[in-house]
């Protein structure tokens, strides 16, 4: 039985279309398509003779048709006008003719889309984030990558609009990274620039680690006092310290060389982020010994954190 | 007391090359990022890059990356500046100047300058 | 690259005066923002950073406001000693950038 398959079916507008016609008769000797779901001259497209090899144009003939020899038409450069139904009639040398229909769909070529935010610099367990995909086109699907993966699943997260809009609802450090939106529809799809969601967070609660040089368990007269504060912020944490209440340097480490007992007291590292308006801090009491039995840093360690 | 001390004042042709030093003392070296700032004759502050002292880690400006390689010597507490494919236009004050603590602070003790004049 | 934008350019005011200089960032600062003094023919010297805190040894009539984008560096009574040109320099990260300074001068 005479059959039509549209290679695509789904075809992106400006693209091209083939119809290939499949089990065509023996006693073939010429072929007509016609644009619609049956025979009728006014909306032939073209004609063609095998004999002869010779095509000739119908009224609906737009001069984007090429036909070929199996029979197969193909349509370039194709409008949303084109959609529709397509009929090739066989012609035979027993005048006994056959007839097919095939259809495609023509969809329109999609724009590159791109990302609109209502804050790219979100404060952590403070700020939310709409993400809005543009521009709006019908009858299209809107999907999201995160770091080139499709959305996790999260309760904070939350698709609206037609999923044209993300919502990150109090946004997570772990939320920050690139952001795209795809629209598709049957016949193409693409792709956004990356956007770069940036999640400022921190200070959090310091630690301090005490290295001592020469290494040893415990702070001895004459060792090296080294003290290394960590905090994990974006942006980084402006750093500084005081000891017993006086303010001394704005480095992550403090160093001083071959303590004393005079070194005995209270050790902060203060941090502070202006970006988040948060600042923390963490106390430790340090001990020295003038002989060889040092009690070292105390075991309870203080910490402050404000907001 | 803090000091950052340069090396003295070069003439280069173009295409040459300059390495300016900058020699601290006053604090524990390896501890603070010093970063390099040059001032065109009757113009404004331009930043260059800097170094960590302790790591060795450089970042630099846009402009003049692959020209600028900063580079340490612990054992002498100084660092150097060194600019390539020099151009009329490098003509300026360079300075060195220590970051006030770590990670986004601005720069509290600066070097006196080097003239670095590029002239053929 | 952040662009900072100081103004005016210049400035020409009495003694006793408050000088008001603006400085404003292409981007927010969150308040990483510093001023330098520069005396001709001298180093720059940092008067303020975080947007206020002034550094020891500044006198007082130096002071620092603003947020965001827009900061202002005063100068609530203008001294003789005070004639040089003032940058400002977002301070958040690098590259850091300058403004392109503004000349005070007495009149």
């Known amino acids: 039985k005479l059959t039509i398959e549209s290679t695509p079916f789904n075809v992106a507008e400006g693209k091209e279309v083939l119809l290939l016609a499949h089990n065509l008769p023996q006693n073939r000797i010429g072929y007509s398509w016609y644009k619609g779901e049956r025979v009728d001259g006014n909306s032939l497209i073209v004609g063609y003779v095998i004999g002869t090899q010779q095509a000739t144009p119908g009224p609906a003939y737009s001069g984007r048709e090429t036909i070929y020899p199996n029979a197969s038409l193909l349509i370039q450069n194709v409008t949303q006008n084109d959609t529709g139904f397509y009929t090739l009639q066989v012609i035979k040398s027993d005048l006994v003719n056959e007839e097919a229909t095939g259809q495609f769909h023509v969809y329109p070529e999609l724009p590159k889309p791109s990302i609109s935010s209502n804050n790219s610099n979100p404060v952590e367990d403070k700020d939310a984030v709409a993400f809005t995909c543009e521009p709006e086109v019908q009858n299209t699907t809107y999907l999201w990558w995160v770091n080139g993966q499709s959305l996790p699943v999260s309760p904070r997260l939350q698709l609206s609009n037609g999923n044209m809009t993300l919502t990150l609802l109090s946004v997570k450090r772990n939320d920050a990274g690139s952001y795209e939106c795809e629209i598709q529809n049957p016949a193409s799809a693409n792709r956004s620039d990356p956007v770069t969601l940036n999640v400022l967070y921190g200070p959090d609660v310091p630690t301090i680690s005490p290295i001592i040089s020469p290494p040893d368990s415990s702070y001895l007269s004459g060792a090296n006092l080294n003290l290394s504060c960590h905090s994990a912020s974006n942006p980084s944490p402006q750093y500084s310290w005081r000891i017993n209440g006086i303010p001394q340097q704005h480095t992550q480490v403090l160093f001083i060389a071959k303590i004393t007992p005079n070194n005995n007291g209270t050790y902060a590292c203060f941090v502070s982020n202006l970006a988040t308006g948060r600042n923390n801090s963490i106390v430790k009491s340090i001990t020295v010994s003038a002989s060889g039995t040092s009690p070292g840093l105390s075991a309870g360690a203080h910490h402050h954190h404000h907001h | 007391q803090v000091q950052l001390v340069q090396s003295g004042a070069e003439v280069k042709k173009p295409g040459a090359s300059v390495k300016v030093s900058c020699k601290a003392s006053g604090y524990i070296f390896t501890s603070y990022w010093l970063h390099w700032v040059r001032q065109a004759p009757g113009q404004g502050l331009e930043w260059i890059g800097y170094?960590?002292?302790?790591?060795?880690?450089?970042s630099y400006a846009q402009k003049f990356q692959g020209r600028v390689t900063m580079t340490r010597d612990t054992s002498t507490s100084t660092v150097y500046m060194e600019l390539s494919s020099l151009r009329s236009e490098d003509t300026a004050v360079y300075y060195c100047?220590?970051?006030?603590?770590?990670?986004?602070?601005?720069?509290?003790?600066w070097g006196q300058g080097t003239l670095v004049t590029v002239s053929s | 690259d952040i662009q900072m934008t100081q103004s005016p350019s210049s400035l020409s005011a009495s003694v006793g005066d408050r000088v008001t200089i603006t400085c404003r960032a292409s981007e927010n600062q969150y308040g990483y923002l510093a001023w330098y003094q520069q005396k001709p023919g001298k180093v720059p010297k940092l008067l303020i950073y975080?947007?206020?805190n002034l550094v020891e040894g500044v006198p007082s009539r130096f002071s620092g406001s603003g947020s965001g984008t827009d900061f202002t560096l005063t100068i609530s009574s203008l001294q003789p000693e005070d004639v040089a040109t003032y940058y400002c320099q977002h301070h958040l990260g690098t590259p850091y950038t300058f403004g392109q300074g503004t000349k005070v001068e007495i009149k």
């Open positions: 100047a220590r970051e006030y603590g770590n990670y986004n602070y601005p720069l509290d003790y």
């Open positions: 975080n947007t206020k």
């Open positions: 170094i960590n002292p302790n790591t060795g880690y450089t």
